[in-house]
C-alpha cells in the first residue's frame, strides 16, 4: 500500500480475524493512523516488541498507532495485542517509501525470478530473503482463520520450495478445503484452520548447491461458547415515510444455536418500563437462526403509530445479546422534514 | 504479578517416575505456549519440551522422548511433565517457562525451579 | 547436547566492554531469532535481550547483541559488578524437527 497522504489501515472497528502479516510502504514525513480494536477498547500496540506510549511523536493510543510525521526509523515491525492476551489483532511492518523491499507482501523483488539469471554463475546455495518475516515460529490462531506460512528465498539456480507437516510431504489432499501453494510468493495458505490442522510446518527450500529450511509451529485454538455476537450498527436507525415499507436487519454470529427475537418497545399506562425496572415490550418475530429471513423484520405500509424503539434479541445455550434501533415515520405530506432520533444502543 | 511456581520435585530412585507442576498467575495462560528447561548441577540450560496454547502440540528434546509427557490444564493455570523411566542424568533444576509471541519466541518469564534427583 | 558454542569464560574490570560469542549453524542462529538469557548466582535464568537488541523493561542498554550469519555475540559495556552471572545464548532450531537449544554458557566475572 502507497499513499501519498496519510495512511490509515482501517476505521477503529472490530479487527479482523485474519492474522496475515501487512507491509506498508510510508513516504517520509508523511502521518501514519492505524486502528486496532474498537477505540473505547483498542489493542495495545508495540514495536519490535516495545510497547508504546500514549503520548509523544509516535504513539499507541486507545487502539490507534500515530505517528504525526514518518521518519526513517520509525519503519520496523508493529505488532497490536488484544488488551490482557497474547492474541494478534494487527500484524504489520512499515518501511520508508525509498526502500528497496517490495510494498507488497506478495511480491519479492529478491525472488531472482529472471529466467536469464537462472543459470548465471556464481551458483549461490538457498538464502532467506526477507528473515525479518520468518521471525514468528510459535503460531496459535483460532479455528476457521486463514494462515500463510511464508519462507521467501532465492539462490542460483532459483531454488525450489516444498512443505512438509510433522516431516511429511504435505500436499493438502487430505485436508478439507486444501491448501494454496504459491511457489512464486513461497507461501502455503491454509484456509478455515482446523484443530486436526495443528502441527510443525516446514518449508525446504533447495537447489542444486545446497538446502534451507525453516520449521513453524501451529496450534489451532478451538472456539470458546460464547453468547451470540451482533454485527455492530444493525439494526440502524431508520427513517420512513407513512405507508412505506421498512426492513430492519440484523446479524446475527453465533457458534451454539441462537433463538432470535424482534421486539418493539411500547407504552403502558404512560410508562416504558415495568415495576421490575424492565422495558414494555411486544414480541414481533420469534425463530432460530435457521428460519428463513428470521434476521430481517419486515415492517408493510408504516404508520406512524409503528414510529419508536424496536430491538433484535438473539439468545443461546451461553447467554443473551441484544441491540436497538429507531425508527423514525414521517407524514406523507412533507417527505423532506427529518427528525432526530436517538442514537441506536447498543450492547457487547 | 507474572509468576510460574513449580511444585513436585524430590528423590527418586532410577527407573521411577515423578509428576512435576507449575502454577502460572498474573497472565492468560490459555494464550501462551509453555515449556520446560532443566540444568544439572553445575552445568549448563538443557530444552526438555514445549507446549501449545491448546495443549494439542508438543516437542521433545531428543534426550526425554518417549520417557517424558508435557501436558497442561488450563482451566487450572498449570502446566505439568510427567517424567518415566528417570535416569541419574535426569537429575536437574526443573524450570517452567513461558514462551513469549512478543519476545519472538523466547522464552520471558521463569519459574524459581524444582530440584529432581535421581538416585539410588 | 549443545549446539551452540560459547566460551567458558570471560572477564573484565568495572567500566570496560566485554563480548560474548556464540557460534551455532546455518539451522539454528543462521535461520532464527537469538535469544540471550542472564542467570545470577543461585537464581533462574532471565531473558536478557533479544532479536535485533530488543530488550524486556528492566534491562538497560548497556547489553547489546549483534549477528552475522551463523555466529551471533552479546556485548556489556560499562560493566558493573551486578553484571557477574553465567550468559547464555539460544535459538530456536530447524534441523529435522524444530527443537530449542542453548549455548554451553558463558560466566562472566567482574574483576
Known amino acids: 500500500l502507497e499513499a501519498s497522504e496519510e495512511v490509515e489501515l482501517e476505521p477503529c472497528l472490530a479487527p479482523s480475524l485474519e492474522q496475515q502479516e501487512q507491509e506498508l510502504t510510508v513516504a517520509l514525513g508523511q502521518p501514519v493512523r492505524l486502528c486496532c480494536g474498537r477505540a473505547e477498547r483498542g489493542g495495545h500496540w508495540y514495536k519490535e516488541g516495545s510497547r508504546l506510549a500514549p503520548a509523544g511523536r509516535v504513539r499507541g493510543w486507545r487502539g490507534r498507532l500515530e505517528i504525526a510525521s514518518f521518519l526513517p526509523e520509525d519503519a520496523g515491525r508493529y505488532l497490536c495485542l488484544a488488551r490482557g492476551s497474547m492474541i494478534v489483532l494487527q500484524n504489520l511492518t512499515l518501511i520508508t517509501g525509498d526502500s528497496l523491499t517490495s510494498s507488497n507482501d506478495d511480491e519479492d523483488p529478491k525472488s531472482h525470478r529472471d529466467p536469464s539469471n537462472r543459470h548465471s554463475y556464481p551458483q549461490q546455495a538457498p538464502y532467506w530473503t526477507h528473515p525479518q518475516r520468518m521471525e514468528k515460529k510459535l503460531h496459535a490462531v483460532p479455528a476457521g482463520n486463514t494462515v500463510k506460512f511464508r519462507c521467501p528465498a532465492a539462490g542460483n539456480p532459483t531454488p525450489t520450495i516444498r512443505w512438509l507437516k510433522d516431516g511429511q510431504a504435505f500436499h493438502g489432499e487430505n485436508r478439507i478445503g486444501g491448501i494454496r501453494l504459491r511457489h512464486q510468493h513461497w507461501s502455503l495458505v491454509m484456509e478455515s484452520v482446523v484443530p486436526s490442522d495443528r502441527g510443525t510446518y516446514t518449508c525446504l527450500v533447495e537447489n542444486a548447491v545446497g538446502s534451507i529450511r525453516y520449521n513453524y509451529l501451529l496450534d489451532v485454538l478451538e472456539r470458546s461458547p460464547h453468547r451470540p455476537i451482533l454485527q455492530a450498527g444493525l439494526p440502524a436507525n431508520t427513517t420512513a415515510v407513512v405507508g412505506s415499507d421498512v426492513e430492519l436487519l440484523c446479524k446475527v454470529y453465533s457458534d451454539a444455536q441462537p433463538h432470535i427475537q424482534w421486539l418493539k418497545h411500547i407504552v403502558i399506562n404512560g410508562s416504558s418500563f415495568g415495576a421490575d425496572g424492565f422495558p414494555y415490550v411486544q414480541v414481533l418475530k420469534t425463530a432460530d437462526i435457521n428460519s428463513s429471513e428470521v434476521e430481517v423484520l419486515y415492517l408493510r405500509n408504516v404508520s406512524a403509530e409503528d414510529a419508536g424503539e424496536y430491538t433484535c434479541l438473539a439468545g443461546n445455550s451461553i447467554g443473551l445479546s441484544y441491540q436497538s434501533a429507531w425508527l423514525t415515520v414521517l407524514p406523507e405530506e412533507d417527505p423532506t422534514w427529518t427528525a432526530a432520533a436517538p442514537e441506536a444502543r447498543y450492547t457487547d | 504479578e507474572v509468576q510460574l511456581l513449580e511444585s513436585g520435585g524430590g528423590l527418586v530412585q532410577p527407573g521411577g517416575s515423578l509428576r512435576l507442576s507449575c502454577a502460572a498467575s498474573?497472565?492468560?495462560?490459555?494464550?501462551?505456549?509453555m515449556g520446560w528447561v532443566r540444568q544439572a548441577p553445575g552445568k549448563g540450560l538443557e530444552w526438555v519440551s514445549v507446549i501449545s496454547p491448546s495443549g494439542g502440540l508438543t516437542i521433545y528434546a531428543d534426550s526425554v522422548k518417549g520417557r517424558f509427557t508435557i501436558s497442561r490444564d488450563n482451566s487450572k493455570n498449570t502446566l505439568y511433565l510427567q517424567m518415566n523411566s528417570l535416569r541419574a542424568e535426569d537429575t536437574a533444576v526443573y524450570y517452567c517457562?513461558?514462551?513469549?509471541?512478543?519476545?519472538?519466541?523466547?522464552?520471558?518469564?521463569w519459574g524459581q525451579g524444582t530440584m529432581v534427583t535421581v538416585s539410588s | 547436547q549443545y549446539e551452540l558454542t560459547q566460551p567458558p569464560s570471560a572477564s573484565g574490570t568495572p567500566g570496560q566492554r566485554v563480548t560474548i560469542s556464540c557460534s551455532g549453524s546455518?539451522?539454528?542462529?543462521?535461520?532464527?531469532?537469538v535469544h540471550w538469557y542472564q542467570q545470577l548466582p543461585g537464581t533462574a535464568p532471565k531473558l536478557l535481550i533479544y532479536?535485533?537488541?530488543q530488550r524486556p523493561s528492566g534491562v538497560p542498554d548497556r547489553f547489546s547483541v549483534s549477528k552475522s550469519g551463523s555466529s551471533a555475540s552479546l556485548a556489556i559495556s560499562g560493566l558493573q559488578s551486578e553484571d557477574e552471572a553465567d550468559y547464555y545464548c539460544?535459538?530456536?532450531?530447524?534441523?529435522?524437527?524444530?527443537?530449542?537449544?542453548f549455548g554451553t554458557g558463558t560466566k562472566v566475572t567482574v574483576l
Open positions: 532479536g535485533n537488541n
Open positions: 517457562a513461558r514462551s513469549s509471541g512478543w519476545a519472538l519466541d523466547a522464552f520471558d518469564i
Open positions: 539460544a535459538s530456536w532450531d530447524d534441523s529435522l524437527k524444530a527443537f530449542y537449544v
Open positions: 546455518s539451522s539454528n542462529i543462521g535461520s532464527n531469532i
Open positions: 498474573g497472565f492468560t495462560f490459555s494464550h501462551y505456549w
